[in-house]
Protein backbone atom coordinates (compact mmCIF):
# COMPACT_ATOMS: atom_id res chain seq x y z
CA UNK A 1 0.00 0.00 0.00
CA UNK A 2 1.58 3.23 -0.93
CA UNK A 3 1.59 6.62 1.04
CA UNK A 4 -1.27 8.65 -1.06
CA UNK A 5 0.33 12.09 -2.73
CA UNK A 6 -1.05 15.05 -1.42
CA UNK A 7 -4.32 15.97 -3.39
CA UNK A 8 -3.80 19.09 -5.73
CA UNK A 9 -7.43 20.29 -4.71
CA UNK A 10 -6.44 20.60 -1.09
CA UNK A 11 -2.23 21.09 -1.38
CA UNK A 12 0.10 22.98 -3.52
CA UNK A 13 3.57 21.34 -3.65
CA UNK A 14 5.41 23.91 -2.15
CA UNK A 15 9.13 24.77 -3.51
CA UNK A 16 10.81 24.08 -0.92
CA UNK A 17 10.34 19.92 -0.72
CA UNK A 18 13.24 18.38 -0.42
CA UNK A 19 14.54 16.49 -3.79
CA UNK A 20 13.54 12.72 -3.10
CA UNK A 21 14.43 9.64 -5.39
CA UNK A 22 10.93 8.31 -6.97
CA UNK A 23 9.48 5.04 -5.89
CA UNK A 24 10.80 6.52 -2.18
CA UNK A 25 10.51 9.03 0.51
CA UNK A 26 12.48 10.85 2.98
CA UNK A 27 11.83 10.21 6.84
CA UNK A 28 13.55 11.80 9.45
CA UNK A 29 12.95 9.36 12.42
CA UNK A 30 13.84 11.70 15.35
CA UNK A 31 10.16 11.22 16.81
CA UNK A 32 7.92 14.21 17.35
CA UNK A 33 6.66 14.39 20.98
CA UNK A 34 8.78 11.51 21.63
CA UNK A 35 9.31 12.65 25.50
CA UNK A 36 5.64 13.73 25.70
CA UNK A 37 5.12 11.67 29.28
CA UNK A 38 1.07 10.06 29.25
CA UNK A 39 -0.11 9.88 32.65
CA UNK A 40 -1.88 6.36 31.56
CA UNK A 41 -5.20 5.03 34.75
CA UNK A 42 -3.02 2.61 37.05
CA UNK A 43 -2.88 -0.87 37.49
CA UNK A 44 -6.33 -1.06 34.37
CA UNK A 45 -4.49 -4.55 33.48
CA UNK A 46 -4.84 -5.99 36.48
CA UNK A 47 -8.29 -4.32 37.89
CA UNK A 48 -10.30 -4.85 34.52
CA UNK A 49 -12.77 -7.80 34.06
CA UNK A 50 -10.80 -8.69 31.33
CA UNK A 51 -7.40 -8.51 32.39
CA UNK A 52 -4.10 -9.00 30.66
CA UNK A 53 -0.16 -9.40 30.73
CA UNK A 54 2.13 -7.61 28.52
CA UNK A 55 4.90 -9.06 26.38
CA UNK A 56 8.00 -7.12 25.54
CA UNK A 57 9.21 -8.20 21.69
CA UNK A 58 12.45 -7.07 21.02
CA UNK A 59 13.56 -6.59 17.55
CA UNK A 60 16.91 -5.04 16.93
CA UNK A 61 16.34 -4.33 12.71
CA UNK A 62 13.23 -2.64 13.73
CA UNK A 63 12.48 0.90 14.96
CA UNK A 64 11.70 1.23 17.49
CA UNK A 65 13.21 -2.20 18.59
CA UNK A 66 10.74 -2.49 21.69
CA UNK A 67 7.09 -3.40 21.04
CA UNK A 68 4.75 -4.50 24.00
CA UNK A 69 1.68 -6.41 23.30
CA UNK A 70 -1.06 -7.31 25.79
CA UNK A 71 -2.38 -11.04 26.00
CA UNK A 72 -6.10 -11.32 27.58
CA UNK A 73 -5.35 -13.61 31.06
CA UNK A 74 -8.59 -15.84 31.04
CA UNK A 75 -10.83 -16.79 28.37
CA UNK A 76 -13.85 -15.33 30.33
CA UNK A 77 -14.41 -12.41 32.61
CA UNK A 78 -14.20 -11.81 36.40
CA UNK A 79 -17.39 -11.76 37.98
CA UNK A 80 -18.10 -9.94 41.25
CA UNK A 81 -16.96 -12.28 42.93
CA UNK A 82 -13.26 -12.83 41.55
CA UNK A 83 -14.36 -16.10 39.82
CA UNK A 84 -13.92 -16.70 36.25
CA UNK A 85 -17.47 -16.23 34.00
CA UNK A 86 -16.92 -18.38 30.88
CA UNK A 87 -20.28 -17.12 29.57
CA UNK A 88 -18.90 -13.56 28.58
CA UNK A 89 -15.25 -13.46 27.02
CA UNK A 90 -11.81 -11.79 27.06
CA UNK A 91 -11.34 -10.25 23.86
CA UNK A 92 -8.11 -8.64 22.51
CA UNK A 93 -8.39 -4.53 21.37
CA UNK A 94 -5.70 -3.91 18.91
CA UNK A 95 -4.73 -1.26 16.77
CA UNK A 96 -1.98 -0.48 13.91
CA UNK A 97 1.07 1.18 14.50
CA UNK A 98 3.93 2.17 12.02
CA UNK A 99 7.46 0.72 12.41
CA UNK A 100 10.89 1.40 9.98
CA UNK A 101 12.13 -2.02 9.20
CA UNK A 102 15.93 -2.10 8.55
CA UNK A 103 16.87 -4.95 6.04
CA UNK A 104 20.05 -6.38 5.17
CA UNK A 105 20.94 -7.59 1.59
CA UNK A 106 24.63 -8.35 1.18
CA UNK A 107 26.56 -5.56 2.32
CA UNK A 108 23.70 -2.69 1.66
CA UNK A 109 21.21 -1.90 3.38
CA UNK A 110 17.49 -0.92 2.60
CA UNK A 111 14.93 0.67 4.87
CA UNK A 112 10.93 0.12 4.79
CA UNK A 113 7.75 0.65 6.76
CA UNK A 114 5.86 -1.43 8.20
CA UNK A 115 2.57 -1.67 9.51
CA UNK A 116 2.61 -3.75 12.62
CA UNK A 117 -0.95 -4.99 14.81
CA UNK A 118 -0.50 -4.33 18.40
CA UNK A 119 -2.73 -5.59 20.79
CA UNK A 120 -3.27 -2.62 23.39
CA UNK A 121 -5.72 -4.68 26.00
CA UNK A 122 -8.54 -6.48 26.56
CA UNK A 123 -12.70 -6.06 26.87
CA UNK A 124 -14.94 -8.11 28.18
CA UNK A 125 -18.21 -9.30 25.46
CA UNK A 126 -21.42 -10.91 25.33
CA UNK A 127 -20.69 -13.41 22.34
CA UNK A 128 -23.13 -13.93 20.01
CA UNK A 129 -24.66 -17.35 19.55
CA UNK A 130 -24.80 -19.89 17.38
CA UNK A 131 -26.31 -23.07 17.93
CA UNK A 132 -25.60 -25.13 15.16
CA UNK A 133 -27.50 -28.24 14.03
CA UNK B 1 19.09 4.93 18.39
CA UNK B 2 19.59 0.88 18.25
CA UNK B 3 22.57 -1.02 17.19
CA UNK B 4 22.45 -3.02 14.30
CA UNK B 5 23.91 -6.87 14.07
CA UNK B 6 26.09 -6.68 10.74
CA UNK B 7 27.58 -8.97 7.90
CA UNK B 8 31.28 -9.30 9.49
CA UNK B 9 33.06 -9.24 5.75
CA UNK B 10 31.02 -5.36 5.10
CA UNK B 11 32.78 -2.20 5.05
CA UNK B 12 33.36 -0.57 8.93
CA UNK B 13 31.81 2.35 8.17
CA UNK B 14 28.45 1.84 8.34
CA UNK B 15 26.78 3.39 11.62
CA UNK B 16 25.32 0.72 13.99
CA UNK B 17 22.35 2.61 14.93
CA UNK B 18 19.80 3.49 13.04
CA UNK B 19 20.26 6.95 10.82
CA UNK B 20 18.87 10.54 11.72
CA UNK B 21 17.05 10.28 8.35
CA UNK B 22 17.06 7.50 6.33
CA UNK B 23 15.10 6.80 2.58
CA UNK B 24 12.51 4.61 2.56
CA UNK B 25 10.17 2.72 0.10
CA UNK B 26 6.92 4.33 -0.72
CA UNK B 27 5.30 0.90 -0.33
CA UNK B 28 5.02 0.06 3.06
CA UNK B 29 5.00 -3.51 4.39
CA UNK B 30 2.32 -5.73 5.89
CA UNK B 31 -1.40 -6.29 3.89
CA UNK B 32 -3.32 -3.64 2.92
CA UNK B 33 -4.84 -4.36 6.84
CA UNK B 34 -8.98 -2.54 7.26
CA UNK B 35 -8.29 0.60 8.94
CA UNK B 36 -11.99 0.76 10.13
CA UNK B 37 -12.27 -0.10 13.46
CA UNK B 38 -16.38 -0.78 12.93
CA UNK B 39 -15.49 -2.89 9.67
CA UNK B 40 -13.15 -5.49 11.70
CA UNK B 41 -15.55 -6.19 14.81
CA UNK B 42 -18.24 -5.14 16.59
CA UNK B 43 -16.62 -5.74 19.72
CA UNK B 44 -17.46 -1.79 20.47
CA UNK B 45 -21.46 -2.18 20.64
CA UNK B 46 -21.06 -6.17 22.41
CA UNK B 47 -18.52 -5.14 25.32
CA UNK B 48 -19.75 -4.36 28.32
CA UNK B 49 -17.52 -0.93 28.53
CA UNK B 50 -19.37 -0.14 24.93
CA UNK B 51 -17.74 2.74 22.69
CA UNK B 52 -18.24 4.87 20.14
CA UNK B 53 -15.99 5.48 17.54
CA UNK B 54 -14.70 8.90 16.02
CA UNK B 55 -13.30 9.89 12.82
CA UNK B 56 -10.24 12.00 12.80
CA UNK B 57 -9.05 13.14 9.90
CA UNK B 58 -5.56 15.10 9.31
CA UNK B 59 -4.25 15.54 5.61
CA UNK B 60 -0.76 16.26 6.93
CA UNK B 61 -0.71 12.82 8.51
CA UNK B 62 -0.20 9.17 7.35
CA UNK B 63 -2.60 7.62 8.06
CA UNK B 64 -4.73 10.54 7.30
CA UNK B 65 -7.85 8.87 9.07
CA UNK B 66 -7.33 7.80 12.78
CA UNK B 67 -10.12 6.54 15.06
CA UNK B 68 -10.71 7.80 18.19
CA UNK B 69 -13.01 5.53 20.53
CA UNK B 70 -14.87 7.72 23.82
CA UNK B 71 -16.69 5.26 26.37
CA UNK B 72 -20.47 5.31 25.83
CA UNK B 73 -21.14 5.22 29.28
CA UNK B 74 -18.97 6.36 33.21
CA UNK B 75 -20.17 2.45 34.04
CA UNK B 76 -20.48 -0.88 32.74
CA UNK B 77 -23.36 -2.92 31.34
CA UNK B 78 -24.79 -5.65 33.72
CA UNK B 79 -26.07 -8.95 32.46
CA UNK B 80 -29.52 -6.69 33.01
CA UNK B 81 -28.71 -4.61 30.53
CA UNK B 82 -28.37 -1.74 32.89
CA UNK B 83 -25.37 0.81 33.54
CA UNK B 84 -24.12 -0.65 36.60
CA UNK B 85 -22.36 2.91 38.75
CA UNK B 86 -20.38 0.53 40.61
CA UNK B 87 -17.92 -0.18 38.06
CA UNK B 88 -15.89 2.01 36.01
CA UNK B 89 -15.64 1.93 31.81
CA UNK B 90 -12.26 2.98 30.94
CA UNK B 91 -10.33 3.91 27.82
CA UNK B 92 -7.36 1.94 26.86
CA UNK B 93 -4.73 3.96 25.85
CA UNK B 94 -1.96 3.65 23.20
CA UNK B 95 0.86 5.35 21.74
CA UNK B 96 1.22 4.95 17.88
CA UNK B 97 3.82 5.87 15.35
CA UNK B 98 2.45 8.19 12.69
CA UNK B 99 4.04 9.62 9.31
CA UNK B 100 3.76 13.92 9.56
CA UNK B 101 4.39 15.65 6.34
CA UNK B 102 7.29 17.70 7.09
CA UNK B 103 7.87 20.13 5.69
CA UNK B 104 4.16 21.05 5.22
CA UNK B 105 2.73 20.00 2.36
CA UNK B 106 5.25 18.14 0.60
CA UNK B 107 4.44 14.67 -1.11
CA UNK B 108 7.22 12.48 0.32
CA UNK B 109 9.22 14.36 2.91
CA UNK B 110 8.04 12.86 6.41
CA UNK B 111 8.90 12.51 10.57
CA UNK B 112 7.95 10.04 12.44
CA UNK B 113 5.02 11.40 15.30
CA UNK B 114 4.61 9.62 18.75
CA UNK B 115 0.28 10.33 19.29
CA UNK B 116 -2.00 8.83 21.89
CA UNK B 117 -4.86 6.92 20.81
CA UNK B 118 -7.80 5.31 22.51
CA UNK B 119 -8.46 2.01 21.22
CA UNK B 120 -11.40 0.75 23.08
CA UNK B 121 -12.79 0.61 26.35
CA UNK B 122 -13.03 -2.06 29.70
CA UNK B 123 -14.79 -2.32 32.20
CA UNK B 124 -12.50 -2.08 35.67
CA UNK B 125 -13.73 -2.76 39.19
CA UNK B 126 -12.09 0.79 41.17
CA UNK B 127 -10.92 0.62 44.80
CA UNK B 128 -13.14 1.96 47.26
CA UNK B 129 -11.96 4.60 49.25
CA UNK B 130 -14.06 6.28 52.05
CA UNK B 131 -12.57 10.08 52.62
CA UNK B 132 -12.85 10.82 56.88
CA UNK C 1 -3.71 11.42 50.23
CA UNK C 2 -7.23 12.87 48.60
CA UNK C 3 -9.80 14.59 50.70
CA UNK C 4 -13.52 15.94 49.33
CA UNK C 5 -14.88 18.66 51.01
CA UNK C 6 -19.12 18.81 50.40
CA UNK C 7 -21.22 21.86 50.91
CA UNK C 8 -24.77 22.98 50.00
CA UNK C 9 -26.67 20.52 51.66
CA UNK C 10 -29.95 21.62 53.57
CA UNK C 11 -33.49 21.72 54.05
CA UNK C 12 -35.47 22.96 51.22
CA UNK C 13 -39.45 22.84 50.39
CA UNK C 14 -40.95 20.46 47.30
CA UNK C 15 -40.59 22.87 43.99
CA UNK C 16 -37.49 24.47 45.24
CA UNK C 17 -33.48 24.58 44.51
CA UNK C 18 -30.28 23.67 46.34
CA UNK C 19 -26.89 23.62 44.81
CA UNK C 20 -24.28 21.01 46.09
CA UNK C 21 -20.37 21.48 45.65
CA UNK C 22 -17.81 18.93 45.88
CA UNK C 23 -13.76 20.07 46.18
CA UNK C 24 -11.40 17.97 46.01
CA UNK C 25 -7.89 18.57 46.69
CA UNK C 26 -4.73 16.28 47.42
CA UNK C 27 -3.24 13.81 44.52
CA UNK C 28 -6.68 13.59 42.72
CA UNK C 29 -5.13 13.75 39.35
CA UNK C 30 -5.65 11.87 35.83
CA UNK C 31 -9.25 11.77 37.32
CA UNK C 32 -11.85 9.51 35.22
CA UNK C 33 -14.96 11.17 36.09
CA UNK C 34 -16.64 12.99 39.12
CA UNK C 35 -20.47 12.74 40.67
CA UNK C 36 -23.04 12.13 43.12
CA UNK C 37 -24.64 9.31 44.25
CA UNK C 38 -27.47 9.00 47.41
CA UNK C 39 -28.73 6.71 49.82
CA UNK C 40 -31.46 6.73 51.75
CA UNK C 41 -32.04 4.78 55.47
CA UNK C 42 -31.87 1.00 54.29
CA UNK C 43 -31.63 1.34 50.63
CA UNK C 44 -28.19 0.92 48.41
CA UNK C 45 -26.46 4.33 46.83
CA UNK C 46 -27.77 4.71 44.12
CA UNK C 47 -25.77 6.83 41.42
CA UNK C 48 -27.72 10.51 40.81
CA UNK C 49 -24.85 12.21 38.01
CA UNK C 50 -21.55 12.10 36.85
CA UNK C 51 -19.50 14.12 34.63
CA UNK C 52 -16.50 12.52 32.71
CA UNK C 53 -13.63 14.90 32.81
CA UNK C 54 -11.70 14.56 29.78
CA UNK C 55 -14.68 15.93 27.80
CA UNK C 56 -17.75 17.07 30.26
CA UNK C 57 -19.69 13.89 28.95
CA UNK C 58 -22.76 13.72 31.86
CA UNK C 59 -24.83 11.42 32.66
CA UNK C 60 -27.95 10.68 35.15
CA UNK C 61 -30.06 8.74 36.85
CA UNK C 62 -33.49 8.74 35.06
CA UNK C 63 -34.88 9.53 38.22
CA UNK C 64 -33.03 13.23 37.69
CA UNK C 65 -32.81 13.32 34.50
CA UNK C 66 -34.03 17.45 33.43
CA UNK C 67 -34.18 18.50 37.26
CA UNK C 68 -30.70 18.42 37.98
CA UNK C 69 -27.55 19.17 36.33
CA UNK C 70 -23.87 18.39 37.12
CA UNK C 71 -21.07 20.95 36.38
CA UNK C 72 -17.52 21.09 36.97
CA UNK C 73 -14.87 23.73 37.10
CA UNK C 74 -11.34 22.02 36.59
CA UNK C 75 -9.12 24.29 37.09
CA UNK C 76 -10.55 23.99 40.80
CA UNK C 77 -11.20 20.41 40.92
CA UNK C 78 -14.41 20.77 41.19
CA UNK C 79 -17.94 19.39 40.70
CA UNK C 80 -21.51 20.99 41.21
CA UNK C 81 -25.00 19.82 41.58
CA UNK C 82 -27.45 21.79 40.57
CA UNK C 83 -30.88 20.73 41.99
CA UNK C 84 -34.39 22.11 40.95
CA UNK C 85 -37.78 20.89 40.96
CA UNK C 86 -36.73 18.58 44.09
CA UNK C 87 -39.14 16.01 45.48
CA UNK C 88 -39.96 14.61 48.60
CA UNK C 89 -38.60 11.70 47.14
CA UNK C 90 -34.93 13.06 46.50
CA UNK C 91 -34.28 13.42 50.30
CA UNK C 92 -31.23 11.81 51.16
CA UNK C 93 -27.61 11.45 51.86
CA UNK C 94 -25.43 13.10 48.57
CA UNK C 95 -22.19 11.47 48.39
CA UNK C 96 -19.50 12.87 46.11
CA UNK C 97 -17.83 10.57 44.34
CA UNK C 98 -14.25 11.11 42.99
CA UNK C 99 -12.82 8.30 40.01
CA UNK C 100 -9.76 7.69 39.52
CA UNK C 101 -10.61 4.85 37.14
CA UNK C 102 -8.89 1.92 39.27
CA UNK C 103 -9.51 3.88 42.61
CA UNK C 104 -12.48 5.55 43.77
CA UNK C 105 -13.00 7.19 46.91
CA UNK C 106 -16.17 8.86 48.40
CA UNK C 107 -17.22 11.78 50.26
CA UNK C 108 -18.74 11.60 53.88
CA UNK C 109 -21.98 13.09 52.69
CA UNK C 110 -24.53 15.94 52.62
CA UNK C 111 -27.66 15.54 54.15
CA UNK C 112 -30.38 16.89 51.47
CA UNK C 113 -34.18 17.03 53.13
CA UNK C 114 -37.70 17.91 51.22
CA UNK C 115 -40.30 18.35 52.56
CA UNK C 116 -43.20 21.08 53.23
Known amino acids: RKIPKVGHTFFQKPESCPPVPGGSMKLDIGIINENQRVSMSRNIESRSTSPWNYTVTWDPNRYPSEVVQAQCRNLGCINAQGKEDISMNSVPIQQETLVVRRKHQGCSVSFQLEKVLVTVGCTCVTPVIHHVQ | GITIPRNPGCPNSEDKNFPRTVMVNLNIHNRNTNTNPKRSSDYYNRSTSPWNLHRNEDPERYPSVIWEAKCRHLGCINADGNVDYHMNSVPIQQEILVLRREPPHCPNSFRLEKILVSVGCTCVTPIVHHVA | EVQLVESGGGSVQPGGSLRLSCAASGRANSINWFGWFRQTPGKEREFVAG????????EYANSVKGRFTISRDNSKNTVDLQMDSLRPEDTAVYYC?????????WGQGTLVTVSS
Open chain 3, 97 to 105: VLDLSTVRY
Open chain 3, 51 to 58: IRWSDAYT
